[in-house]
């Protein structure tokens, strides 16, 4: 049963590798070759189509047995060399070879443009063994060809460490022109020349290009692909596209808009995000950029007080992140704020002005000319001062905070007193005799407590001392004043 000639027909998707096969029905051998003993190479024809033997890629394997029997030469049959077809059509091509069974072990694989086609599920191998020869037909089919299927296909048979290679089968997929480069949208300066590029390929070649501006053809005569269109300049927006023509028909590129750069629109929705005594955080929504990226923005700040001199403070910042903290502002002040942004063409108009106010802050300076007296008869300490300058109060004075520290024999005690805003003097009871009293005063607004004045020290003697003199805030640079009575 096994010696009878059989046909094996098997789809085999994975290459390289052994060929599939199945022992099925008896049939007359497709090929008949002399018996192996004293074997002479015979003419080998394709099982599917008779033809002359092909000697172009003959392999005569070098391996010889201990009995020095040379193996006969092997070659793939001639097959169609060039297949031209339209995109999305199906194609099937094959290579065939007759292998004397004395070779005993072969593998076959399909290659495209020098790369092995692994896992090629559209590859089928049929083989027809008889006792002497196995005829092999390796078929490759593509159901719907694409441009990527273009290329040179070959069969490779590996046999006894030799490779036998078929003639290439060139697959040429023809279709409508295919764009490899299309014009790109651009933003251009008014009346300035610029270029647009369009490139398309076949097959079939040649591919000719027509340019279209606002639905009208620009060039009467087509240009061979690739084509560069030089536009001398535009004064208004225009739409360009290109048409690619070959023998199969025409393909139109996407239409691209060419915009004319202009100054930006003013920012909108300027809003106050946060206010402090000396700063305001603002944000804004940028206007239309005029087809040119924003470079930077300018924040303009005016005092809203009608009595102010109307000078404008200008703060420059980057265009992003549409946020800016305006600093060095007066406390409890009203300001008008506007924003303008620029691109390469110029500055936008200023946004609508918005009104913003700073909040009340803590005073920025301490009360001035602090003096301290000991009133021994009433056992009090009198304190006098001058209120800080109005501008530096940073708000409405609500009073003062007095710190008095009593130090005696290594013991220290701090007391705090609050005083109403009207006075500029205070009286505190003597806490400890034979001690030093250190006094500091800070102005207070609803915005907080300002800095304390420099300390003023007065010595409170034991009972019975009569003379006393005031102690006052020292001149700058002097040591701490101490009044000893």
């Amino acid at each position: 049963a096994i010696t009878e000639a059989r046909e094996e027909a098997k789809p085999y998707p994975l290459f390289p590798g052994p060929f599939p096969g199945s022992l099925q029905t008896d049939h007359t051998p497709l090929l008949s070759l002399p018996h192996a003993s004293g074997y002479q190479p015979a003419l080998m024809f394709s099982p599917t189509q008779p033809g002359r033997p092909h000697t172009g890629n003959v392999a005569i394997p070098q391996v010889t047995s201990v009995e020095s029997k040379p193996l006969p030469p092997l070659a793939f049959k001639h097959t169609v060399g060039h297949i031209i077809l339209s995109e999305h059509k199906g194609v099937k091509f094959n290579c065939s070879i007759s292998v004397p069974n004395i070779y005993q072990d072969t593998t076959i694989s399909w290659w495209k443009d020098g790369k092995e086609l692994l896992g090629a599920h559209h590859a089928i191998t049929q083989f027809y063994p008889d006792d002497e020869v196995t005829a092999i037909i390796a078929s490759f089919s593509i159901t719907s060809v694409q441009r990527s299927d273009n290329g040179s296909y070959i069969c490779k048979m590996k046999i006894n460490n030799e490779e036998i290679v078929s003639d290439p089968i060139y697959i040429e997929v023809q279709g409508l022109p295919h764009f490899t480069k299309q014009p790109e949208s651009m933003n251009v300066t008014r009346n300035t020349a610029f270029n647009l590029t369009c490139q398309a390929v076949g097959p079939p070649e040649p591919v000719n290009i027509f340019w279209v501006q606002n639905s009208s053809r620009v060039n009467e005569q087509p240009e061979k692909s690739p084509s560069v269109l030089t536009v001398p300049g535009l004064t208004e927006m225009a739409v360009f596209s290109c048409e690619a023509h070959n023998d199969k028909g025409l393909t139109v590129s996407k239409g691209v808009q060419i915009n004319i750069k202009a100054i930006p629109s003013p920012p909108t929705e300027v809003s106050i995000r946060n206010s402090t005594a000396h700063s305001i955080l603002i944000s804004w929504v940028p206007g239309f950029d005029g087809y040119s990226p924003f470079r930077n923005c300018s924040i303009q700040v005016k005092e809203a007080d009608p009595l102010s001199n109307g000078s404008v403070m200008i703060f420059n910042t980057s265009a992003l992140p549409h946020l800016y903290q305006i600093k060095q502002l007066q406390a409890l002040a009203n300001y008008s704020i506007g924003v303008s942004c620029m691109n390469e063409i110029g500055w936008s108009a200023v946004s609508p002005w918005i009104l913003a106010s700073t909040t009340e802050g803590a005073p920025s300076v301490a009360p001035l000319n602090v003096t301290v007296f000991l009133n021994e008869s009433s056992d009090n300490v009198d304190i006098r001062w001058m209120k800080p300058p109005t501008k530096q109060q940073d708000g409405e004075l609500v009073g003062y905070r007095i710190s008095h520290v009593w130090q005696s024999a290594g013991i220290s005690k701090e007391l705090l007193e609050e005083v109403g805003q009207n006075g500029s003097r205070a009286r505190i009871s003597v806490q400890v005799h034979n001690a030093t009293c250190t006094v500091r005063i800070a102005a207070v607004t609803r915005g907080g407590v300002g800095p304390f004045s420099d300390p003023v020290k007065i010595f409170i003697p034991a009972h019975g001392w009569v003379d006393y003199a005031p102690s006052s805030t020292p001149a700058p640079g002097n040591a701490d004043p101490v009044l000893i009575i």
Epitope: Y12, L14, G17, F19, T64, N101, Q104, G119, D131, T134
Partner: antibody, heavy 120, light 107 residues
């Protein structure tokens, strides 16, 4: 009818050599490769390699390089497996098996097997 | 090397039952797989090749299926003479390798 007839059982000592024969009949011997397969007692099958019966070129699996030799006597349609310097782990049944076609590497006909016993 | 794994060393069945023996390859072998049957003291016997093609003279109750890495031998209407070891073998690439075998026995 295609048949592969193997030689009878062998009892050998460690270090000795054994040569097993596999005689083919019912087909053209030089048209089909011959494989050798080892089966240790109670174990699975292990492919040892094959020999091209036309050229005489052997191919050995990695585990069977060195002490194992495949050879032919074409005129007698016989393939041989020789194991040199026998070791205890060589104790097994050895099958010859015919490679089915030039393009398929499975075995369509098997010999009955030769049991080699290695004992000191 | 391509490793073939037959998960069940033993499978119990009854006469008339249907049984499926599986074989998993460590990498894609396409459909280059055979199944063979071996009874004690006998050589293996080819049942299926190219994963699903029945060898000459093999009863049609034996069916092979699968491709890539997962393969199955199904025996419908198990007969007492089917009690044996079953091995899968891949011949996608050298070295040729076998599964460890599955022993089919009566319940």
């Amino acid at each position: 009818q295609v048949k592969l007839e193997e030689s009878g059982p062998e009892l050998k000592k460690p270090g000795e050599t054994v040569k097993i024969s596999c005689k083919a009949s019912g087909y053209t011997f030089t048209n089909y490769g011959m494989n050798w397969v080892k089966q240790a007692p109670g174990k699975g099958l292990k492919w040892m390699g094959w020999i091209n019966t036309y050229t005489g070129e052997p191919t050995y699996a990695d585990d069977f390089k060195g002490r194992f030799v495949f050879s032919l006597e074409t005129s007698a349609s016989t393939a041989y497996l020789q194991i040199n310097n026998l070791k205890n782990e060589d104790m097994a049944t050895y099958f010859c098996a015919r490679k089915s076609t030039v393009v398929s590497r499975y075995f369509d006909v098997w010999g009955a097997g030769t049991t080699v016993t290695v004992s000191s | 090397d391509i490793v073939l794994t037959q998960t069940h060393k033993f499978m119990s069945t009854s006469v008339g039952d249907r049984v499926s023996i599986t074989c998993k390859a460590s990498q894609d072998v396409g459909d280059a797989v055979t199944w063979c049957q071996q009874k004690p003291g006998q050589p293996p016997k080819l049942l299926i090749y190219w994963a699903s093609t029945r060898h000459t003279g093999v009863p049609d109750r034996f069916t092979g299926s699968g491709s890539g890495t997962d393969f199955t031998l199904t025996i419908n209407n198990v007969q007492s003479e089917d009690l044996a070891d079953y091995f899968c073998q891949q011949y996608r690439s050298y070295p040729l390798t076998f599964g460890a075998g599955t022993k089919l026995e009566l319940k």
